[in-house]
Interface confidence: low
């Protein structure tokens, strides 16, 4: 039985050209996290494997950095980065948990102050 829940930064906005931190947290379960995948729609951004560490997709390696924690930092944002992002926790024995974050990248004067850098 899957008892865990995923908390995310939810819907966030950021300025074009800026940076953002995508953060998910798995709670309410004692399952072991074996791997976390970060995906943008149907594209794999990064993998954090419990044994092998981080792997960043080559097409994103210049704009994506690991962390903090199991989160992901995106920089040099463009309006094309607007969309859904998913953190996919692979756990044992529970199975897979998925969290969703919607990121909207806005022109510099539009993004609300304080909406960037969603750091806990």
């Amino acid at each position: 039985m899957m008892t865990g829940t995923i908390e995310t930064t939810g819907n966030i906005s950021a300025e074009k050209g800026g940076s953002i931190i995508l953060q998910c947290h798995l709670s309410s379960t004692t399952a072991q996290v074996t791997q976390v995948n970060w995906e943008q729609q149907d594209q794999l951004l990064a993998i954090c494997n419990a044994d092998l560490g981080w792997h960043i997709s080559p097409s994103f390696k210049d704009r994506v950095a690991p962390g903090p924690g199991l989160g992901l930092t995106l920089q040099s944002l463009t309006v094309n980065d607007t969309g859904e992002y998913f953190c996919i926790y692979h756990t044992y024995p529970d199975g897979t948990y998925t969290g969703r974050i919607f990121l909207e990248v806005l022109e510099s004067s539009v993004a609300e102050h304080g909406a960037r850098f969603q750091i806990p």
Epitope: C48, G53, W54, I56, K61, P66, G67, P68, G69, L70, P120
Partner: nanobody, 113 residues
């Protein structure tokens, strides 16, 4: 106790250099990556640079070519060599790692003539 201790900050003139250190201790396994963030007065905390255990590095556009991040895996220590410092680099610099969800106490870097 798991902790991160940053050091090496101080007052430096524009164009000068500083080397920050971050010592990680108390971990049951070595971090797979370590990184630096900074927070200037009245501004949001921003990512500066990260280094993977295997040595791959990333930099924010604002510091690329001026800052160099490195790590000594045997000591679980990360370093940030900061050259050609500018007044806008003034901030409290924080170290973080995948093994610790929080932050250290930070080290203040002031760039001023």
């Amino acid at each position: 106790e798991v902790q991160l201790v940053e050091s090496g900050g101080g007052l430096v003139q524009p164009g000068g250099s500083l080397r920050l250190s971050c010592a990680a201790s108390g971990f049951t396994f070595s971090p797979s990556w370590m990184g630096w963030f900074r927070q200037a007065p009245g501004k949001e905390r921003e990512w500066v640079a990260s280094v993977l255990r295997g040595g791959y590095t990333w930099y924010a556009d604002s510091v690329k070519g001026r800052f160099t991040i490195s790590a000594d895996n045997s000591k679980n220590t990360a370093y940030l060599q900061m050259n050609s410092l500018k007044p806008e680099d003034t901030a409290v610099y924080y170290c973080t790692t995948d093994s610790l969800p929080g932050w250290g106490q930070g080290t203040l870097v002031t760039v001023s003539s």
